[in-house]
Every structure is written in C-alpha cells, then in structure tokens.
C-alpha cells in the first residue's frame, strides 16, 4: 500500500509556483497529462492539460497555468504564475490512460498563497511576470471532462489514504466513485 503524501509550498501573491512531476517515460511519454485541484467534498477538477498525444517540450497555457511535458526526461513541469490568495488549495498531476483510471503522480501539492510582499532589497520577486515570459507559441488543449456516477459527499482520499501503486505512480482504480474519465473514441 502507498501513502498519498503532500508537499507544501508557501508563497505570496504575485509569485510563481514551479513544480515538476516525475513519470515513467517509457510508459507515459506521449500520454495526456493534467493539473488538477482537489477541493474537499468535490471531485478533482482539471485546470489544464497537455495535448493528446502530449507533445514534447511544447508549452500549453491555460490562463495563468503553463504546462510543459519533457518526454526525454519523464518530467511534466507545471507553473502557476501571478498567484492569488484564491489559488490556495491541494493540487495534483495526473496522467490520463483511457479506458483505465488516471494515474496520480507524487506528491500532491498543498499551495498556500498569502497576501503581502516578502521581497528583499535587490531581489526581483516583484518581477514575476518578467521572469516568466510566456512563450508566444502556447496552445490551449482540450481536457477530458470528469463525470461521476453519483454525487460525491465525501472528500477525496486524505494524505493517509492507502491506494495501490504500479511503478512510480499511484493507480486510482480503488477510488472509481471519485474519479471517472470517459473513454476516448
């Protein structure tokens, strides 16, 4: 059994979250990947996803979220720029693998965004948008919609939940009432 774990990032408004999700490249290099938020009592909500099939090193931008999938390294880079307090929450990377349930990649990210400016003289924290210049050739991909056979009345698994794991990803087959992905044609 595998423990779902969380990693906390404490950031200020206007700053950027920059995380990397590690996956098994032989199995999932071209698979579609997504960035989701998990709110208590709700199904995970997909905020952004790569194209299908996922393109190597091709930035996908959805609002303030930028995804870049590096097939050669087995890495999905996720950036959330110009963070707002309302962005606080629990996030995860998943890999779509229809018709099977998606894989969730370690670790979940507990993002805490607070108001205020924590800059120091000489730092360029106030130039987040300059540091993160979004490439002009970004693409907005269509993400699979999540559906559920019944209303979710409980929160998704907490960080102590046990689920099975193949290789280096968590297989969510044991929580099918929480996550559903339609089969692609």
């Amino acid at each position: 059994a595998t423990k779902l774990t969380e990693e906390k990032y404490e950031l200020k408004e206007g700053q950027t979250l920059d995380v990397k999700c590690d996956y098994t490249l032989e199995k999932f290099a071209s698979s579609q990947k997504a960035w989701q938020i998990i709110r208590d009592g709700e199904m995970p909500k997909t905020l952004a996803c790569t194209e299908r099939p996922s393109k190597n090193s091709h930035p996908v931008q959805v609002g303030r979220i930028i995804l870049e999938d590096y097939h050669d390294h087995g890495l999905l880079r996720v950036r959330m720029v110009n963070l707002q307090v309302e962005d606080s929450g629990l996030y995860q990377c998943v890999i779509y693998q229809p018709p099977k349930e998606p894989h969730m990649l370690f670790d979940r990210i507990r993002l805490v965004v607070t108001k205020g400016f924590s800059g120091t003289p000489g730092s360029n924290e106030n130039s987040t948008q300059n540091v993160y210049k979004i490439p002009p050739t970004t693409t907005k991909a269509l993400c699979p919609l999540y559906t559920s056979p019944r209303t979710v009345t409980q929160a998704p698994p907490k960080s102590t939940a046990d689920v099975s794991t193949p290789d280096s990803e968590i297989n969510l087959t044991n929580v099918t009432d929480i996550i559903r992905v339609p089969v692609f044609n």
Partner: antibody
Amino acid sequence: EVQVLESGGGLVQPGGSLRLSCAASGFTFNAYAMSWVRQAPGKGLEWVSTISGSGSTTYYADSVKGRFTISRDNSKNTLDLQMNSLRAADTAVYYCAKVAGSNFFFDHWGQGTLVTVSS
Amino acid sequence: EIVMTQSPATLSVSPGERATLSCRASQSINSNLAWYQQKPGQAPRLLIYGAYTRATGIPDRFSGSGSGTEFTLTISSLQSEDFAVYYCQEFIMWPPYTFGQGTKVEIK
C-alpha cells in the same frame, strides 16, 4: 519516518572500483527519484548522480560520467552507485539523498559513507 | 551549467543577532532554490525549498526570500545550534544541480 543508510565505503587504489549501497525505508521508494551527493574533505557539496523513481532516467555529473553507474532495485528499496576507474579526486563522503516529490531538492539525507582513493 | 555564488564565505555573528546570507545564480532560476544547513560531522539538512518555504520541523526564525538570481537566507535571532555551514542549491530543471560553495556562520 524516512530513513536512508549508506554502506560500502572504504579505501581503494586509483583505478580501482567500489560499489556503494543505500537502504531506504519509511516512504514509497519507487515513487521518488534518488541521488548521490558527495563532499570532499573540507570542501562543499557536489551533486554526483540522480535516478528517477522508476529507474528509467539517469543523470550524471560530468566529472563522473562514463565511470559511475547509478541503479536502483525497487523491490528491495535499495540504491546503488557503481564506481569504476576511481581517482584521487573522487575521495569524499558520499551521501545518499531522497529527492523531493515536487522538485529536485533533497529532503532526506543519509549520514554518508567515506570513500578514500589512495595508493 | 548554472553557477551558484554564496557570500560572505564566513559570517561572524553573536548569539541573538540577525544573520543574512546571500546566494546568487549565474542565470535566472526563478524560485527553484533550496537552502541546507550542515554541522561538522553531520549530513546536510534541508531548511528552505522553493526559495521561501520552510521544510518540516524548521523553526520560523529561518526565512528565505528572493527570486530570479538573488536569494537570501535570514536567521532572525541566532541560537547556539544555528552555528554551521549553509549551502544553497538550484533545481531549475534537470541536472546538473549545483550548490553554492557555502557560508560558514561562526560565533563572534
């Protein structure tokens, strides 16, 4: 509790070989990349090698490329570093380190094992 | 390869005083920076990651700031157990991951 424990260090002659091992516990081993970081006596930290959670991706510092091989056995929760063609400059304490799940920093370190390359 | 430069090499501070350590990257690493503490004969210990976030169990007298190329580790009120060597490390993407040469914080 996350624990990593290195073994296999010792004295070896230049040109010789040595295999370091790291036993890990307290976390889902196959879900995390692992690394080796070394520290020469009285010097700073130097990243040596990293392997992804599945073992499918490996990285090496230029100073050890072609001489060192990193590997892992996820069924045994062990990490290895095979060191060949050793040089005096490889003398250092070698640390096994768990890579964080969200980025490439090192959130847990072993106590290190000393490798001395000398004739 | 990104070069990380720490300053000063040695910082002499009295207990209870504030210590400010600097780390500079040769190119922008955004917020992809970690700070470690190492005491003699011990392994390094993670203090700060993502430039600002304290690792589990790290006292709040330790704080990190900066982004891009300039970073700071601040120890607001030095305790006896804080005298050690501190290293910064970048992790912008894949390896090589480079460390600064370290700053030794010693008792004044």
